[in-house]
């Protein structure tokens, strides 16, 4: 299953499959997730080691048993790949690292006014993988405000050095934020020239394209079909690059297919997995296990659950079957692709779904790095769980926020439905940033069921929580994915990095905002909160947040939206925006429904018809 815990001051011994330099443990974990054989990783921060060559070292590891012995190493961080972790799987990495220079091939230098502008330039350059920016206080005046765009053979820095007044980061192309745009078309009977960066076997051109999209240096590809004239080259997928970023030439060639990486697509990237099953096809590879199962779909599920399995073949040969069950061959290879593809066999083959974003319903998100009063504009994909609850009567308007917590579930405040309990009038918009982008053609979700907490009473502050079941499940993308729920009765965690988001008023007597706002607000103890609200009962099922001096808060229109806190690299839904005295007033914190106190209720109500929870808190 999905293991998200990190081990501090621990290093896994042995099992090395690759090593590289990464700026932090989260990026190292992401590289492990996308490496075909990596199950475990260990990372050495600069502070953990004197050896300059090993500083920022990221060590990717495999193990037949799924684990390795841990040795104590001060400062080291170790953990697991996020394969099988559903919507937590993302190649998107937004963080900017201060005081760090990520080295690589510098291919473009320009003057810019901020590190954000430098990151944007990198994201909008087809070859840029990462960048470094010299701030205005950099010691050499001639380098100040320099933005260096970089690449490397593996997509990670060739070295990382601690350097004052330098800030570094990665391209946001994997976040689907590139302005370049992409070529969706595939060209039949056409071969591209230029440099081959890798060669894999794939059953069709679409799998070849997805592999190209997630390969650090692939910009375009040529696929040789299963009827290509040279037998040894059939089903070969050549991943390619060029100096210019586009093919320098193309040749008409029967039974070849060419196309482009989709990494530069805006707003939508293909999933990093291949879910299609290929009947009549055998995938060859190293044998991991053989098991008898009933049906090819069960074979695929078995492969997906066995974390080291990369692909499978389900044999329908009479000698491989007994009763209704047949042999399911679970296989792997060095590069994650079959070592042989054979057609016209009595088998069906496919890939593990361990890297599918939509994966398992029962895990929670770690990713992403009332208007809000005193807030700032959010950016695309920053809060992908935030939804807008809108009512359409004669006109349509935003009324409340909400949080996506599963494919078909939104968590919000019960008071949003005061006087509007009819599910037909509601429209739920997800994956949006600007309310002005909503037109009559913008897709929205309709409500199948509104579940208001049984103890909620109108105009009382208690039990202000409601679940919305959507009529149809939503697919997860970089801009639309769920927030992790806290553990039941979570009281031990001390949250220091909490944010409230919403489109609500920017002042008490204001109006709904166009761009989703965010504000960083500290949590306040319930004792402190009770002192500020002597006319109300602040219960253990509430959580408060706000600045003593006021100025930053949720406000009308933010209700039902999330109060999220980041802990150990993972965002959790700590509160639901509920009530407060005015907005952002001095010594009047906002009051939020404490989600951890309602975990039993949430899990009970979200049981699917087969009795399996649709979402779950971290173990």
């Amino acid at each position: 299953g999905c293991l998200t815990q990190l081990y501090e001051n621990a290093f896994f011994r042995g099992g090395d499959v690759a090593s590289m330099y990464t700026p932090n443990a989260q990026y190292c974990q992401m590289r492990c997730t996308f490496h075909p054989r990596c199950l475990l990783f260990s990372f050495l921060p600069a502070s953990s080691i004197n050896d300059m060559e090993k500083r920022f070292g990221c060590f990717l590891k495999d193990s037949v048993t799924g684990t390795l012995p841990k040795v104590h190493r001060t400062g080291a961080v170790s953990g697991h790949s996020l394969k099988q972790c559903g919507h937590q799987i993302s190649a998107c990495h937004r963080d900017i690292y201060k005081g760090v220079d990520m080295r690589g091939v510098n291919f473009n230098v320009s003057k810019v006014s901020s590190v954000e502008e430098c990151q944007k330039r990198c994201t909008s350059n087809i070859r840029c993988q990462f960048f470094s920016y010299a701030t205005q206080t950099f010691h050499k005046a001639e380098y100040r405000n320099n933005c260096l765009l970089k690449y490397s053979p593996g997509g990670t820095p060739t070295a990382i050095k601690v350097l004052s007044n330098v800030e570094s980061g990665f391209s946001l192309k994997p976040c689907a934020l590139s302005e370049i745009g992409c070529h969706m078309n595939i060209f039949q009977h056409l071969a591209f020239s230029d440099v081959d960066v890798a060669r894999v076997l794939t059953p069709d051109a679409f799998v070849c394209r997805t592999i190209c999209t997630y390969h650090p240096n692939c910009l375009f590809f040529t696929f040789y079909t299963n009827v290509w004239k040279i037998e040894s080259q059939r089903n070969v997928c050549l991943l390619k690059t060029s100096e210019s970023g586009t093919p320098s030439s193309s040749t008409p060639q029967e039974n070849t297919i060419s196309g482009y990486s989709l990494l530069t697509c805006k707003r939508t990237l293909p999933e990093p997995c291949h879910s299609k099953i290929y009947p009549g096809v055998d995938f060859g590879g190293e044998e991991l296990n053989v098991t008898f199962v009933k049906g090819v779909n069960v074979c695929q599920e078995t492969c997906t659950k066995m974390i080291r399995c990369q692909f499978f073949t389900y044999s329908l040969l009479p000698e491989d079957c007994k009763e209704e069950k047949c042999k399911c061959f679970l296989r792997l290879s060095m590069d994650g692709s079959p070592t042989r593809i054979a057609y016209g066999t009595q088998g069906s083959s496919g890939y593990s779904l361990r890297l599918c974003n939509t994966g398992d319903n029962s895990v929670c998100t770690t990713k992403t790095s009332t208007r809000i009063v005193g807030g700032t504009n959010s950016s695309w994909g920053e809060w992908p769980w935030q939804v807008s609850l809108q009512v359409k009567l004669t006109a349509q308007r935003h009324l409340c926020g909400g949080s996506l917590i599963g494919h078909q579930w939104v968590l919000t405040a019960a008071h949003c439905f005061d006087g509007l309990p009819l599910q037909d009038v509601w429209r739920i918009y997800s994956g949006i940033l600007n309310l002005s982008d909503i037109t009559k053609d913008t897709p929205f979700s309709q409500i199948k069921e509104i579940i208001i907490h049984q103890n909620y009473k109108v105009s009382e502050g208690n039990h202000d929580i409601a679940l919305i079941k959507l009529q149809a499940p939503l697919n997860y993308t970089e801009f639309q994915k769920p927030i992790c729920l806290p553990s039941k009765g979570d009281t031990s965690t001390i949250y220091t990095n909490c944010w409230v988001t919403g489109w609500g008023f920017s002042k008490e007597k204001g109006e709904i905002q166009n761009i989703l706002q965010k504000v960083n607000i500290p949590l306040v103890t319930n004792e402190e909160c009770q002192k500020r609200y002597q006319d109300y009962k602040i219960t253990q099922r509430m959580v408060c947040a706000g600045y003593k001096e006021g100025g930053k808060d949720a406000c009308k229109g933010d209700s039902g939206g999330p109060l999220v806190c980041k802990h150990n690299g993972m965002w959790r839904l700590v509160g639901i925006t509920s009530w407060g005295e005015g907005c952002a007033r001095r010594e009047q914190p906002g009051v939020y429904t404490k989600v951890a106190e309602y975990m039993d209720w949430i899990l009970e109500k979200t049981q699917s018809s087969d009795g399996k929870a649709q979402m779950q808190s971290p173990a």
Epitope: P203, D204, A205, F206, N226, S275, P279, G280, T345, T358
Partner: antibody
């Protein structure tokens, strides 16, 4: 030029049999997955059966399973569909189609042959 | 089996009009979506494969788009020779299934 030419259609009584043929030219027939698709009068398209190049793997729609048999003779560049126990609902134009597995489509189709099952 | 729902079932448009046909699938089919054109009394012909890629010889006035479960075929400028029936097909999961068709006529 890729060409597919069906033959063997006609009028047959319910319970009767018919064998359709599809002669292929203009490509290396022995390398391609082939399929039969049918279209009832005034209706949409329905996949009937598929066969891999070697003939080692065949599959059928539930509606024809156990009654129809797909086969091929790569030396004659010909695809066949043996239809037994025919029913009125099998009345349709039958098309043979080549499959491009590299992009998963039916890139070339024959002109079709009409099968009428009626008493 | 994956269900394919095409809309509209028929449409009438003028020459040079922009025409859009929609195809919805009962589950995510990734990019395994093809479009075919069938002239009256003729065999189907492949227009677009993999959602948006034109088959060789097909006019660039045809284009395809979409993702996951919702797809569209667009004819940017309808021509008299475009009359006939258009079918979508999913090739993601066996059995491959077709939409019920959209009949296009000239006003």
């Amino acid at each position: 030029e890729v060409q597919l030419l069906e033959s063997g259609g006609g009028l047959v009584q319910p319970g009767g049999s018919l064998r359709l043929s599809c002669a292929a030219s203009g490509f290396t027939f022995s390398q391609y997955l082939m399929m039969w698709v049918r279209q009832a009068p005034g209706k949409g398209l329905e996949w009937v059966s598929s066969i891999y190049p070697s003939g080692g793997y065949t599959s059928y729609a539930d509606s024809v399973k156990g009654r129809f048999t797909i086969s091929r003779d790569n030396s004659k560049n010909t695809l066949y569909l043996q239809m037994n126990s025919l029913r009125a609902e099998d009345t349709a134009v039958y098309y043979c189609a080549r499959v491009s597995t590299a992009v998963a489509d039916n890139d070339y189709w024959g002109q079709g042959t009409l099968v009428t099952v009626s008493s | 089996d994956i269900q394919m729902t095409q809309s509209p079932s028929s449409l009438s448009a003028s020459v040079r009009d922009r025409v859009t046909i929609t195809c919805r699938t009962s589950q995510n089919i990734n990019t395994y979506l093809n479009w075919y054109y069938q002239a009256p009394g003729r065999a189907p012909k492949l227009l677009i494969f993999g959602v948006s890629s034109l088959h060789r010889g097909v006019s660039s006035r045809f284009s395809g788009s979409g993702d996951g479960t919702e797809f569209t075929l667009t004819i940017s400028s309808l021509q008299p020779e475009d009359i006939g029936t258009y079918f979508c097909q999913q090739s993601y999961s066996s059995p491959w299934t077709f939409g019920q068709g959209t009949k296009v006529e000239i006003k």
